[in-house]
Structures are given as structure tokens and as C-alpha cells.
């Protein structure tokens, strides 16, 4: 996601499963910290946004032709699992300790 | 990158190394097809944008709170190498067949 002024970084995003309609199958938690990647990918791209070569190239092209080519985008580059209690196909409450890819661990420019 | 209306897809982006100042060390090619990921990550996220669970969650939260949370972003999810001829530290023209991460192979919503 983009953000005016600030550089690409991980910010808080509390997600309530009821808000997204997942409370029908996720019993616990009621909400969790998903985090969000926010901010711009500005030149020069810092090491902490772990840019790919393509992101560096795109940033340089954007610098030269800002209306033709977009900036790289601030996105999750590493995700973490969360633990959930959910209803399986049989309606049985089931614990899953590693429900993968639910929370941002790291953000970067891609 | 985002794009008004169209959904996340790979589009052409010809990069001339002179435009980005890399012609000082990359001798060949003069330009190459980098591609760019353009378009929006709209609900519902299609399979072809290979969304992560976090991207799906963020899309749903954006749907509910569009001003608070951004959409997922259309970014390169797989990159390809290119061949380059470059001047090494000794100034010797050197061929590298797999200069990684320079061209977009696939785009997705993250």
C-alpha cells in the first residue's frame, strides 16, 4: 500500500473476524494483529526495504518518467502464522497452531 | 503499482540503461524488457493473482473500511534473470548469463 510522505514500514492493523465475516468458522481469536505495510518506496530505496533489482530499476525509471511508470509498492515480504481455533468440515472445534500467512513479519519495496 | 480500473497484470516496460545511468557499467544490452505489474487488487481476488491469506484479509478489511485500510498491491511475485555484459572491478568486459531479479515473470496481489 502507499502512504503520503512516510516511507515503507509495518504499521498496526487490528482485524476483527466479525468485520470480514470469518467469525462463522474462526472461533478464536475474535481479532488479531495482521499489520499492514504502509508508506512510499522513494528513491533511494533503503536497505531495510530489501529491494529487488527490479524494484530498484523501476524506482529509477519512475524518477525519470514519473507519469509513465509507477513507484515500487510497499508490501509484505515475509508473513507469520497465527494460532486459531476453527470449526472443521464436520463442525468440530479444531486447534491450528500455525495458520500460515496471516500476519506481516516484514515489509519491503517490490 | 496501482492502475485505475484494470486488474493486476503484467505489462510491458522497456528499460534503457542509459535512462537510469547504468550504461556506465552495463555494456549490453542497451535496453531490456523489465515488465511492470499494473492494475488494482479488487475484491474478490482471483486465483491468477495468487493472493496470500494476508492479502485476502486486507482486501476484506478494505471493503469494510476503505478509508482506513488500503487495498493489496499488485507487485512482482516471481522475477526472471537477464543476460548482461558488464565491466567488472578490473574493467574487464564480463558476461553474466543469469543476472537475477531483473525482469517480472509473474504479478500478484500482496
Amino acid at each position: 500500500s502507499t502512504g503520503a510522505g512516510s516511507h515503507c514500514q509495518k504499521t498496526s492493523l487490528r482485524v476483527n473476524f466479525e468485520d470480514i465475516g470469518w467469525n462463522s468458522w474462526i472461533i478464536a481469536p475474535k481479532e488479531y494483529e495482521a499489520y499492514e505495510c504502509k508508506g512510499g518506496c522513494f528513491f533511494p530505496l533503503a536497505d531495510d526495504v530489501t529491494p529487488t533489482k527490479h524494484a530498484i530499476v523501476q524506482t529509477l525509471v519512475h524518477l525519470k518518467f514519473p507519469t509513465k511508470v509507477g513507484k515500487a509498492c510497499c508490501v509484505p515480504t515475509k508473513l507469520s502464522p497465527i494460532s486459531i481455533l476453527y470449526k472443521d468440515d464436520m463442525g468440530v472445534p479444531t486447534l491450528k497452531y500455525h495458520y500460515e500467512g496471516m500476519s506481516v513479519a516484514e515489509c519491503g519495496c517490490r | 503499482s496501482t492502475g485505475a480500473g484494470s486488474h493486476c497484470q503484467k505489462t510491458s516496460l522497456r528499460v534503457n540503461f542509459e535512462d537510469i545511468g547504468w550504461n556506465s557499467w552495463i555494456i549490453a544490452p542497451k535496453e531490456y524488457e523489465a515488465y511492470e505489474c499494473k492494475g488494482g487488487c479488487f475484491f474478490p481476488l482471483a486465483d491468477d493473482v495468487t493472493p496470500t491469506k494476508h492479502a485476502i484479509v486486507q482486501t476484506l478489511v478494505h471493503l469494510k473500511f476503505p478509508t482506513k485500510v488500503g487495498k493489496a498491491c499488485c507487485v512482482p511475485t516471481k522475477l526472471s534473470p537477464i543476460s548482461i555484459l558488464y565491466k567488472d572491478d578490473m574493467g574487464v568486459p564480463t558476461l553474466k548469463y543469469h543476472y537475477e531479479g531483473m525482469s517480472v515473470a509473474e504479478c500478484g496481489c500482496r
Epitope: - | 549490453a28 544490452p29 542497451k30 535496453e31 531490456y32 543476460s83 555484459l85 574487464v92 558476461l95 548469463y97
Partner: antibody
Framework: QVQLVQSGAEVKKPGASVKVSCKAS????????MNWVRQAPGQGLEWMGW????????NYAQKFQGRVTMTRDTSISTAYMELSRLRSEDTAVYYC???????WGQGTLVTVSS | DIQMTQSPSSLSASVGDRVTITCRAS??????LAWYQQKPGKAPKLLIY???NLQSGVPSRFSGSGSGTDFTLTISSLQPEDFAVYYC?????????FGQGTKVEIK
Amino acid sequence: QVQLVQSGAEVKKPGASVKVSCKASGYTFTSYYMNWVRQAPGQGLEWMGWINPVQGNTNYAQKFQGRVTMTRDTSISTAYMELSRLRSEDTAVYYCARNYFDVWGQGTLVTVSS
Amino acid sequence: DIQMTQSPSSLSASVGDRVTITCRASQTISNFLAWYQQKPGKAPKLLIYAASNLQSGVPSRFSGSGSGTDFTLTISSLQPEDFAVYYCQQLYAESITFGQGTKVEIK
């Protein structure tokens, strides 16, 4: 100065194998791929393949797949090219050449004759 | 594989002549093209790399041009030591290929 010195001429019988060496000096051996090129008498140049001296990974021309093996010994900065199941058409001068073909060995004549 | 076609196969010229050799690739190779000179019993010598870059130590009478599929080697004023065979070579594809050669002979 930068140079590549190859092993001496060889005479082989059809069906045999030959192993040509190429010793590098004057530069860091592991910094550049090593190519092998051959030239039959009165003919043009034919690229055979290359070896990356760091990992030892290779890329062979399709024509030589299954018959050529390129290896290296980084401790003595030497690359090797072995060609098996020799036939008379393999009679040629074999050259090693550094990455961008800026430096070449002197060539090794391999004669295949019964 | 990418085919490299040189023309002419041979040419006769005099000292002082301007000589042009062309090379055409069967598909686009950007500027991944080199030119070599080879004299009898010797290894080839790199003259031009990346289509138009003069290799260190090569006389400035040699020049190269072109991009994509069509390339040219020019010798602005032929010298006695320039009589040799000239080869073009593409390094765009991982399967490297040479042209068949152009023999430059004394008229």
C-alpha cells in the same frame, strides 16, 4: 600478464577419450567462466560450452551433450575439457577462452585416426 | 540455435582500402555481438565487443556498428597485417554461435 596455457597435441584412436587442460595465470581464475571452442582443419570456430569455475556448473552446446565433460581444479587454476567416443570428425584444434573471449589459449591439436 | 550469417565469405582488397563485413543474426541479439580476427596457426583475437566497443590494444581503424539483427565490421584503411579471417559471434543466447568467417585476401 594474463594468459592461458594449454596441454600439448594428442593423437587418439576412434572411440577413445581425450582430456585437454588449460592453465590460467595473471588473473583470479574463479572470476570468469571458461569457454571451450574448437576448429576443424580449414573450418570455422565452433563453441563447445563453458564452465563456471566457482561452482563448477557447466553449459554445453547441444551438439556435444553427453560426450563432453568440463571440469576445473581451482587449487591449480586449471580447466579441463574431456571429449569421449572420439571420431575422425573430432580432429581439430581445441581452444580455451576466458569469459568474454578476450584471452585465448594457444590451442591444442587433437588428431583422431585409426 | 541462433544462426549467424556473414557476408561476403571472402573478399580481395588492397592496402589502404576501406573494408566492410556484415553479419546477420537469425533473431534479435541486442548488441551481444563480438568480432574476431584470426591469422593462420593462431588463436582468434577479440577486436570488437558489444557490437561497437573497441577491445583494448586494437587499432582504431577497426570499428563496429549495429544492433538487433544487422551488424557491420569496418576497417577504415586496410593494413598489410589485417589480411586474415574475420568472425562474428553472438553471445545473446546461452548457446553461443559464430559466423562462418570472412577471408580478407590481398588483391
